[in-house]
Interface confidence: low
């Protein structure tokens, strides 16, 4: 995969609102998260029971649906070592990265369909200048898609598209912490499409998350949780073919 | 075809530490999602939760009980072990394995396959 | 932790006609996200738990459609529509909403 972009510029310099090189306009974002503060909801899927938890492909045994979500062996390489060839953010002219992340990467997950729901793991946490990149294609008539940055029991960033919430698309962002969810930030604009392939990428900043989403910026999301090096893994879910998942140092 | 089977000692001595395994097949604990866990039974009794593990090593304990409940995994081996320190003769029970399923979004499944369970007495 | 609370026994059923088993929940299990985390096991006599019931509606594989399951967040009853001698066993509720988790008492359905 070749980026027609650099990220480099993303984060030297502050104060700037449209950093040259992030994904698409930057200028012109509302405050928060969406520009939804305060917004709540009474349950992501009133008068109706969930559609399960892996839509389209239920778990063997108490789970009505096609089986094979899991088909008894581990998915191959899911917890790979850094890939030998190189990866899709060239180091040239990027800041060498330190700490737990001691080269650019990216790691992750191989090239490859993988099995959904994954979990990448984030050894180390995450840490500012940490690039999260997820590629796959929303499959027809889905329902939601989620990314789950989890601290133990916690999740410090859900990050939850729903594609037919009372007829309506949006996208919810959620904090959980001692299993209670918090205030929800929700964001109108939907760049997802069922069936279409799809670019999700999360910047982690010092105090905040950026997404974009097929290189266009799409919302930020202040850190509830401030422990960032606990933040130690990333769960994958939802109505998608995962192609990859990866981690670099920008 | 998903089966599990506990195995014990049958019976032990007040003080001694149970160890437990549970041999499962038709799932693997290295699939993101599985989990597998501990609930025992006293006879005529109801169900009481004891410890889970996660595909990711994460441990869910029942901290409402004694403390010495340790559990762990060999996914390679389809195994998941439960050590309880300090037994006594309340804890005379069916120690139950059972298998669930973890959604980051959707949450917890119900526990949907159970070994038969083994029989443990603790007596003096 | 979250109490769960059942009747030991139900009220006498005869074959063929329905019957109820309540359960209720020292908290509410619904979930900000839409999903209420209760469980139904049935215990047959002599054998393992089986689920019937997760997510407070949701049937589980196998399980015939006599079983229904309904409820409030605190609230919850499971119904079985036409009592065959099979049902028999012990009925138990249980919550995965919070650590830990915890099964109601159970209860025994018993038949005329």
């Known amino acids: 995969m070749a980026d027609n972009f650099s990220l480099h510029d993303a984060l030297s310099g502050s104060g700037n609102p449209n950093p040259q090189g992030w994904p698409g306009a930057w200028g012109n974002q509302p405050a928060g998260a969406g520009g939804y503060p305060g917004a709540s909801y009474p349950g992501a899927y009133p008068g109706q029971a969930p559609p399960g938890a892996y839509p389209g492909q239920a778990p063997p045994g108490a789970y009505p649906g096609a089986p094979g979500a899991y088909p008894g062996a581990p998915a191959p390489g899911v917890y790979p070592g850094p890939p030998s060839g190189p990866g899709a953010y060239p180091s040239s002219g990027q800041p060498s990265a330190t700490g737990a992340y001691p080269a650019t990467g990216p790691y992750g997950a191989p090239a490859g369909p993988l099995i959904v729901p994954y979990n990448l793991p984030l050894p180390g946490g995450v840490v500012p200048r940490m690039l999260i990149t997820i590629l796959g294609t929303v499959k027809p008539n889905a329902n939601r898609i989620a990314l789950d940055f989890q601290r133990g029991n916690d999740v410090a960033f859900h990050f939850n598209p729903r594609f037919n919430e009372n007829n309506r698309r949006v996208i919810v962002c959620n904090t959980k912490l001692d299993n209670n969810w918090g205030r929800e930030e929700r964001q109108s604009v939907f760049p997802f499409e069922s069936g279409k392939p799809f670019k999700i990428q999360v910047l982690v900043e010092p105090d905040h998350f950026k997404v974009a989403v097929n290189d266009a910026h799409l919302l930020q999301y202040n850190h509830r949780v401030k422990k960032l090096n606990e933040i130690s893994k990333l769960g994958i879910s939802g109505d998608i073919d995962l192609t990859s998942a990866s981690y670099t140092m920008i | 075809q998903v089966t599990l089977k506990e195995s014990g000692p049958g019976i032990l001595q007040p003080s001694q530490t149970l160890s437990l395994t549970c041999s499962f097949s038709g799932f693997s604990l290295s699939t993101s999602g599985m989990g597998v866990g501990w609930i025992r039974q006293p006879s005529g009794k109801g169900l009481e939760w004891l410890a889970h593990i996660w595909w990711d090593d994460d441990k869910y304990y029942n901290t409402a009980l004694k403390s010495g409940l340790t559990i762990s995994k060999d996914a390679s081996k389809n195994q998941v072990f439960l050590k309880i320190a300090s037994m006594d003769t309340a804890d005379t029970a069916t120690y139950y394995c059972?298998?669930?399923?973890?959604?980051?979004?959707?949450?917890?499944?119900?526990?949907?396959?159970w070994g038969q369970g083994t029989s443990v007495t603790v007596s003096s | 932790d979250i109490v769960m609370t059942q009747a030991a026994f139900s009220n006498p059923v005869t074959l063929g006609t329905s019957a109820s088993i309540s359960c209720r929940s020292s908290?509410?299990?619904?979930?900000?996200?839409?999903?209420?985390?209760l469980y139904w096991y049935l215990q047959k006599p002599g054998q393992s738990p089986q689920p019937l019931i997760y997510q407070m509606s949701n049937l589980a594989s196998g399980v015939p459609d006599r079983f229904s399951s309904s409820g409030s967040g605190t609230d919850f009853t499971l119904r079985i529509s036409r009592v065959e001698a099979e049902d028999v066993g012990v009925y138990y509720c249980a919550q995965n909403l919070e650590l830990p988790w915890t099964f109601g008492g159970g209860t025994k359905l018993e038949i005329n």
């Open positions: 059972a298998r669930n399923l973890y959604d980051g979004s959707y949450g917890y499944y119900a526990m949907d396959y």
């Open positions: 908290k509410s299990l619904l979930h900000t996200n839409g999903i209420t985390f």
